[in-house]
Interface confidence: medium
């Protein structure tokens, strides 16, 4: 998707995105909060597809690891935090039941604020 | 996922999340930039699964539609912007070929900054 830096923009929080295979992921948390195993391959009409995910998280090497960029520090403490979303994946639960479940994956790095009280 | 407001936190940008069905979505953009049709149902071993997605975008009714919360306005102009990620979906392209493709969906609302010049 279009790069904000190209438009002379900066993000409040620096993020890093990567493709993650089910083999790398191994397990995930489903919508009920249970841990499930992410299957490496998905059966499709013509065989099998490798299961993988596009994940985005806060960049631990970025400039914003100490706090968000551009925040009014007189009023706010800030923190860049990885947020998650849900995607469907073929998984196996603790009872060995295989099925399509929504699992949580990292999708963004956003800034959260807490007000500075009683400096 | 855990609600920042519960921890006395505020987001720099207000977002809204919803489940979107393929029927509502109809089309999407794939990784090559082409428009594809999102199929309503996915064949699985026991029949068919309704295809739907968890989407997050900037809240047009939120307090941050005029700019991000908590920004140092002396130095920065700011804007809350919906960002996208990729998820796999069963789709049909313009040549009626059906297949699993990664499509773009809205997954977050982040703050972008541009420096204030000549103040």
């Amino acid at each position: 998707h279009s790069d904000p830096a190209r438009r002379g923009e900066l993000s409040v929080c620096d993020s890093i995105s990567e493709w993650v295979t089910a083999a790398d992921k191994k397990t995930a948390v489903d919508m009920s909060g249970g841990t499930v195993t992410v299957l490496e391959k998905v059966p499709v009409s013509k065989g099998q597809l490798k299961q993988y995910f596009y994940e985005t998280k806060c960049n631990p090497m970025g400039y914003t690891k100490e706090g968000c960029r551009g925040i009014d520090k007189r009023h706010w403490n800030s923190q860049c935090r990885t947020t998650q979303s849900y995607v469907r994946a073929l998984t196996m639960d603790s009872k060995k039941r295989i099925g399509w479940r929504f699992i949580r994956i990292d999708t963004s790095c956003v800034c959260t604020l807490t007000i500075k009280r009683g400096r | 996922h855990s609600d920042p407001a519960r921890r006395g936190e505020l987001s720099v940008c207000d977002s809204i999340s919803e489940w979107v069905t393929a029927a509502d979505k109809k089309t999407a953009v794939d990784m090559s930039g082409g428009t594809v049709t999102v199929l309503e149902k996915v064949p699985v071993s026991k029949g068919q699964l309704k295809q739907y997605f968890y989407e997050t975008k900037c809240n047009p009714m939120g307090y941050t539609k005029e700019g991000c919360r908590g920004i140092d306005k002396r130095h920065w102009n700011s804007q809350c912007r919906t960002t996208q990620s990729y998820v796999r979906a069963l789709t049909m392209d313009s040549k009626k070929r059906i297949g699993w493709r990664f499509i773009r969906i809205d997954t977050s609302c982040v703050c972008t900054l541009t420096i204030k010049r000549g103040r």
């Epitope: 007189r74 009023h75 007000i115 500075k116 400096r119 | 307090y63 920004i71 306005k73």
Partner: antibody, heavy 118, light 109 residues
Framework: EVQLLESGGDLVQPGGSLKLSCAAS????????MSWVRQAPGKGLEWVSA????????YYADSVKGRFTISRDNSKNTLYLQMNSLRAEDTAVYYC???????????WGQGTTVTVSS | EIVLTQSPATLSVSPGDRATLSCRAS???????LAWYQQKPGQAPRLLIY???TRATDIPDRFSGSGSGTDFTLTTSSLEPEDFAVYYC??????????FGGGTKVEIK
Amino acid sequence: EVQLLESGGDLVQPGGSLKLSCAASGFTFDDHDMSWVRQAPGKGLEWVSATSTDGYATYYADSVKGRFTISRDNSKNTLYLQMNSLRAEDTAVYYCAKLDYYYYMDVWGQGTTVTVSS
Amino acid sequence: EIVLTQSPATLSVSPGDRATLSCRASQNVRSSKLAWYQQKPGQAPRLLIYGASTRATDIPDRFSGSGSGTDFTLTTSSLEPEDFAVYYCQQYYDWPPLTFGGGTKVEIK
């Protein structure tokens, strides 16, 4: 010319409510934090409340916390002070002040008088 | 909360004389985050000095500020008739709350 013009002061009974307004002109309102300061008859200055440029950060003196609410409408270049559960000791001239970035008050309005009495 | 104590409460001086006003803080006001205001009867306060020693726009150079830490001074080198007023100090280092001193009234002797 940079100007602040308060309005809304009145005679009100104890326990009553009042909303003060401060119209700003001559500067970029949404670039500046704003404050309310009051002065009881024959007394000194007392800081009441302050708000950040976007209105998301708000601060109050202990004497008004829970009773007064500061807010702003940047589209109207206006600062507000909603005063509830008013007491006799809230009787004062209320000044609106523009805050410099470091929180001294570089521009003041002419003040509006609030009298709380039965 | 930082408490500011101004002295004297009233200062009687003649026009042309030097006036020295004191503002003492209950704890360190770092970075010289102290301001002085002048208020004439029936008028709003006016900023004179910020940063302990920097004159605000259009303030005559007969007004000067000094000090650091807990002790600050406002000096008027030669009082003009329009300088008779009440003067307040304010700290903006440790807030909330922003705090003012009780004021010093400069009156004609």
